[in-house]
């Protein structure tokens, strides 16, 4: 049943569900300082506009009488207990900044009729697609499937002219909410990636990761994993590895490989890190100083998110339309919007474009350096590196499978 | 977190939570009703035992503000809900009486750590399996599948002289959520039925379930469906279906079978009836006017769920046991109490045993007639009519692949 | 009022550096995208770089790789540091505020004029 | 980026209504609903006309109004006067972080 909402002349809120499970471990208060930050300058762009209304916050907290705390597994149910805290509270907003875990989010969606927009720093999951009423201002894992594919069948690149139809990839089940959630995506059978593979396996065990990367009968020599240098590590340590094995580290939200002085470890040289080409944010904001390379895109994303709510309030008022209409919350879509670091991009499924930047070892200066650049809008690759000084053979990628003439 | 119990010195409660989603469209107030039944069989029980207790039953309802209602399918949170509701009231019995939907209960164990025992009647799903502190008093998926393989593996019957190795299963998704769980569990492909079959497919469309009648290419005599005669009418009408193909419908919660002047249609003569016996239970009680007979089950099951928190109480008390102890939550297993209808016997995991029957419709009299007789305690196959009159050939059950000489 | 002045111009050798400021008033700086935009004598506008709220910058192509926007939120002061400057550079140089829609200036300086010349 | 295509100069009498056209590509004003108009007096500094595509910042007059059909936006001026002689700049978004003006209308009242 409907809630009623704090929605009317002159004063709009947001109503932000402060989750005990989220998809990263970020301090609550570090998430309201963003949602704060960015009050400030949607009521500068309102002021500003000539719109004279009143824009206000209400965080919804959970009690934590029930829940298993802490990561997101247990999240299923976190967000409809908001959300029925926000109705009895007759507390809900124009606008929910929601759940940033998928499991949340998603049943959020299978038990109610969400009639107003909601958006998430998260949900990351295939089985939040395609939702109408929902935003996510975080990279979906179908955006990583769509990036996969356009580059394993790209073979036009002096650097890759082998197309590639096979990969394994490696999951052990103690990922983090993002990465769980990508390599669900790259599992699942259904999904775009599955489809056009020939050959996929998942690992599972790090013995089987180990096992490949000298094994003479390897199906693939692409193996497709998620998770920081460190994780790699842990895995692979200094083991051997054969010379035609690539490993692609995906790593969207961490901008560590763009800061100064940063050196890449010798055990990435056989590896392709993607990532997401970082902004300067909130490096000298007043509520980044306690915020990790990993943790600024959620913080911005809630910003980003209450800069949305703003925009789209700026839009419908200035139009003279009403804010409670299914129009409203079927809106937060197909649009650009001026963001905290720049213009953010929604595509027809309110779920946020990027450029994701795919990055190799120079083995002459051991840095990081970008190969090529992906834009999720458009569906396209762009070589950076004409050269690049890989570590594979003639400084080009291997074939996905090995040629080992007659057996 | 853990909730205060209302379970102390002469008063003790038990929390019924009454779910807006349930496994049976039934009233509540039947429910209710049922409850209520089965408090006065208790108090009378312990006052002869000499125990001076108070003993009731507090309702808990759902506001309806939050999920769609109706069906299990959207009920995943409203066990949650309810117990949250509990814990802010402080009004947590010494035993939860919980959500018959298994969604719910699946999600209640997994989200929170719940230290004090829960009845359902319901919660079938495989996923629901081996939970220390919950007992099911309608038989659960798992106890289904153990039937299947042991009457698939019989082959020393007069009228089964086959072992079984293959199925069919239909399930088009619009099963009520006792036959989704058991078809799920029946599709599942680390089920004890999927693991001992060698080949299995799952029918999804009508046109499939039809054209597999008199298709000579099947890989299968048997079909495995769950519903109750006309469920299985709708979809077979009176279509020709080959002389070697088995129809067994699952329809444990059934009593119409043996009533009297039940004449069985045409269209069964090719289906073997999985139900249970029935008792007399509630045809003359003061709440079942209003039950039909597919309802009497769950309402049975609501009233012995009090009944046996009443035999636990007894033994506990009796023995000067705390009743708000791990101990006791965990104790509601590994036993037979005295139910509204008969003994009614735990298995070692909580979950409930019955005497599964096996009908088939007699040729001569157009009656429903018992076959076997199935006890799921000892897992034991006890035949009933050593020479049915069959539709098959020879009164005898087919191959389950048939033999069509060279091709 | 809310306002904005330009500073630092003048005449400057090709391949000498300049470095622009541009002082903020009357609203919060810190709130606001901030944006360069020039032009050439007798000519269009021709927007040159900008810097949002988050610190992220970005450039016209005929600029990149020489010049630097940069802000000091608590000193309310927008900069474009200018090196390798050509004769084309010659411009009077505005900066303007985001007005928090995409491509729309709602404030502007009066300008400072740069002229390249040896 | 190359710019947006303006005419150089249009005409119009006081009271008349004129209307400038600025064309870009599917890129910049096809692809997004980020068109602004600027007027220049001489000698002075820009000030925003319109802004995404139709809507005007308080002050100005409802005699400027904007549209936009396809890759060509248009700014049109109604019940010309003597002071709405200036040049006139469209621009655009065109993705990424980069805008684009249009080379100037001057537009003469007679």
């Known amino acids: 049943s409907q809630v009623s909402q704090n929605c009317h002349n002159g004063s709009y809120e947001i109503s932000v569900l402060m989750m005990d499970n989220s998809a990263f471990a970020e301090p609550l208060e570090n998430v309201e300082d963003a949602v704060n930050e960015g009050l400030e300058i949607v009521r500068g762009r309102l002021q500003n506009a000539g719109l004279n209304v009143t824009v206000n916050a209400s965080f919804m907290y959970s009690d934590g009488l029930i829940h298993n705390s802490g990561d997101c597994r247990s999240s299923t149910c976190e967000g409809l207990d908001l959300l029925r805290k926000i109705s009895n509270a007759k507390r809900m907003g124009c606008v929910l900044m929601g759940p940033s875990c998928t499991y949340s989010t998603f049943q959020m969606y299978l038990d109610t009729e969400l009639s107003y927009p909601m958006i998430s720093a998260g949900s990351f999951g295939l089985s939040c697609d395609y939702k109408e009423t929902l935003t996510r201002l975080m990279s979906p894992a179908r955006k990583l499937t769509y990036f996969l594919v356009n580059f394993w069948k790209t073979n036009d690149l002096p650097f890759k002219t082998y197309s590639w139809s096979t990969s394994y990839v490696y999951k052990n089940g103690t990922e983090s909410e993002d990465c769980f959630w990508y390599l669900n995506a790259l599992e699942a059978s259904v999904s775009y990636f599955s489809h056009e593979l020939s050959f996929k396996l998942v690992l599972r065990q790090d013995k089987e990761f180990q096992d490949i990367l000298m094994d003479h009968n390897r199906k693939s020599n692409v193996i497709v994993m998620c998770g920081d240098p460190q994780f790699l590590y842990k895995l692979k340590g200094d083991r051997a590895v054969a010379e035609d094995i690539v490993i692609i580290l995906v790593d969207l939200f961490n901008d560590q490989y763009f800061e100064d002085n940063v050196t890449a470890p010798d055990y990435m040289k056989n590896v392709l890190v993607l990532t997401q080409s970082p902004g300067n944010s909130l490096l000298n904001s007043s509520f980044s100083r306690n915020l990790s390379p990993t943790k600024r895109d959620f913080a911005l994303a809630y910003l980003n998110g209450i800069l949305l709510f703003g925009h789209m309030l700026k839009t419908f008022l200035e139009n003279g339309e009403n804010i409670t209409t299914p129009k409203f919350a079927h809106a937060f879509r197909n649009l650009t919007f001026e963001g905290y670091d720049g213009p953010v991009t929604l595509d027809d499924w309110g779920d946020v474009d990027s450029t994701m930047v795919l990055l190799y070892t120079s083995v002459d200066t051991k840095k990081y350096k970008v190969l090529l650049t992906y834009d999720t809008h458009v569906n396209q690759t762009n070589p950076v590196d004409m050269s690049p000084t890989f570590t594979w053979k003639n400084s080009k990628l291997p074939n996905d499978i090995t040629d080992r003439g007659p057996q | 977190s853990q909730v205060s119990q209302n379970c102390h010195n002469g008063s003790y409660e038990i929390s019924v939570l009454m779910m807006d989603n349930s496994a049976f469209a039934e009233p509540l107030e039947n429910v209710e009703d049922a409850v209520n039944e089965g408090l006065e069989i208790v108090r009378g029980r312990l006052q002869n035992a000499g125990l001076n207790v108070t003993v009731n039953a507090s309702f808990m309802y759902s506001d309806g503000l939050i999920h769609n209602s109706g069906d299990c399918r959207s009920s995943t949170c409203e066990g949650l809900d309810l117990l949250r509701k509990i814990s802010n009231a402080k009004r947590m019995g010494c035993v939860l009486m919980g959500p018959s939907c298994t969604y719910s209960t699946f999600q209640m164990y997994l989200d929170t750590e719940l230290s004090y025992p829960m009845i359902s009647a319901g919660s079938f799903g495989l996923s629901c399996d081996y939970k220390e502190t919950l007992t099911r008093l309608m038989s659960p998926a798992r106890k289904l599948t153990y039937f299947l393989v042991n009457f698939w593996k019989t082959n020393d019957l007069p009228f089964k002289t086959y072992s079984w190795s293959t199925s069919y299963v239909y399930k088009n998704g619009t099963e009520s959520e006792d036959c989704f769980w058991y078809l799920n569990a029946l599709e599942a492909s680390v089920s004890y039925f999927s693991h001992e079959l060698s080949f299995k497919l799952v029918l999804r469309q009508d046109k499939e379930f039809q054209d597999i009648l008199m298709d000579h290419n099947r890989k299968s005599n048997v079909i495995v469906m769950c519903g109750d005669p006309q469920f299985l009418y709708k979809l077979k009408g009176d279509r020709a279906v080959a002389e070697d193909i088995v129809i067994i419908l699952v329809d444990l919660f059934n009593d119409q079978y043996f009533e009297d002047n039940v004449t069985a249609p045409d269209y069964m003569k090719n289906v073997l009836v999985l139900t249970q016996s029935p008792g007399n239970s509630l045809l003359n009680s003061s709440f079942s006017r209003n039950l039909s007979p597919t309802k009497r089950d769950f309402a049975l099951a609501y009233l012995n769920g009090i009944l046996l928190f009443g035999h636990m109480l007894k033994t506990f008390l009796e023995n000067g046991e705390n009743i708000t102890t791990p101990k006791f939550a965990h104790a509601f297993r590994n036993l037979t109490f005295e139910g509204y209808d008969g003994p009614v016997t735990l298995d070692d995991w909580g979950d409930v045993d019955s005497t599964m029957v096996l009908l088939y419709t007699s040729v001569d009299t157009k009656k429903y007639k018992v076959l076997l007789t199935y006890d799921t305690h000892v897992n034991q196959t006890n035949p009933v009519d050593m020479s049915p009159t069959f539709t098959w050939k020879n009164s005898k059950l087919p191959n389950d692949i048939t033999d069509r000489g060279p091709q | 009022q809310v306002q904005l002045v330009e500073s630092g111009g003048g005449l400057v050798k090709p391949g000498g550096s300049l470095r622009l400021s541009c002082a903020a008033s009357g609203f919060t700086f810190s709130s606001y995208s901030m944006n360069w935009v020039r032009q050439a004598p007798g000519k269009g506008l021709e927007w040159v770089s900008v810097i949002y709220s988050g610190g992220s910058t970005h450039y016209a192509d005929s600029v990149k790789g020489r010049f630097t926007i940069s802000r000091h939120n608590s000193k309310n002061t927008l900069y474009l540091q200018m090196n390798s400057l050509r004769a084309e550079d010659t411009a009077v140089y505005y900066c303007a505020r985001g007005a928090g829609t995409l491509n729309a200036f709602d404030i502007w300086g009066q300008g400072t004029t740069v002229t390249v010349s040896s | 980026q190359s710019g947006l295509t303006q005419p150089p100069s249009t005409s119009g009498s006081p009271g008349q209504s004129v209307t400038i056209s600025c064309t870009g590509t599917s890129s910049d004003v096809g692809a997004y609903s980020y068109v602004s108009w600027y007027q220049q007096h001489p000698g002075k500094a820009p000030k925003l006309l319109i802004y995404?595509?139709?809507k005007r910042p308080s002050g100005v007059p409802d005699r400027f109004s904007g549209s936009k059909s396809g890759n060509t936006a248009s700014l049109t001026v109604s019940g010309l006067q003597d002071e709405d002689e200036a040049d006139y700049y469209c621009?655009?978004?065109?993705?990424?972080?980069?805008?684009?003006f249009g080379g100037g209308t001057k537009l003469t009242v007679l």
């Open positions: 995404a595509v139709t």
């Open positions: 621009s655009s978004f065109a993705g990424g972080s980069t805008l684009v």
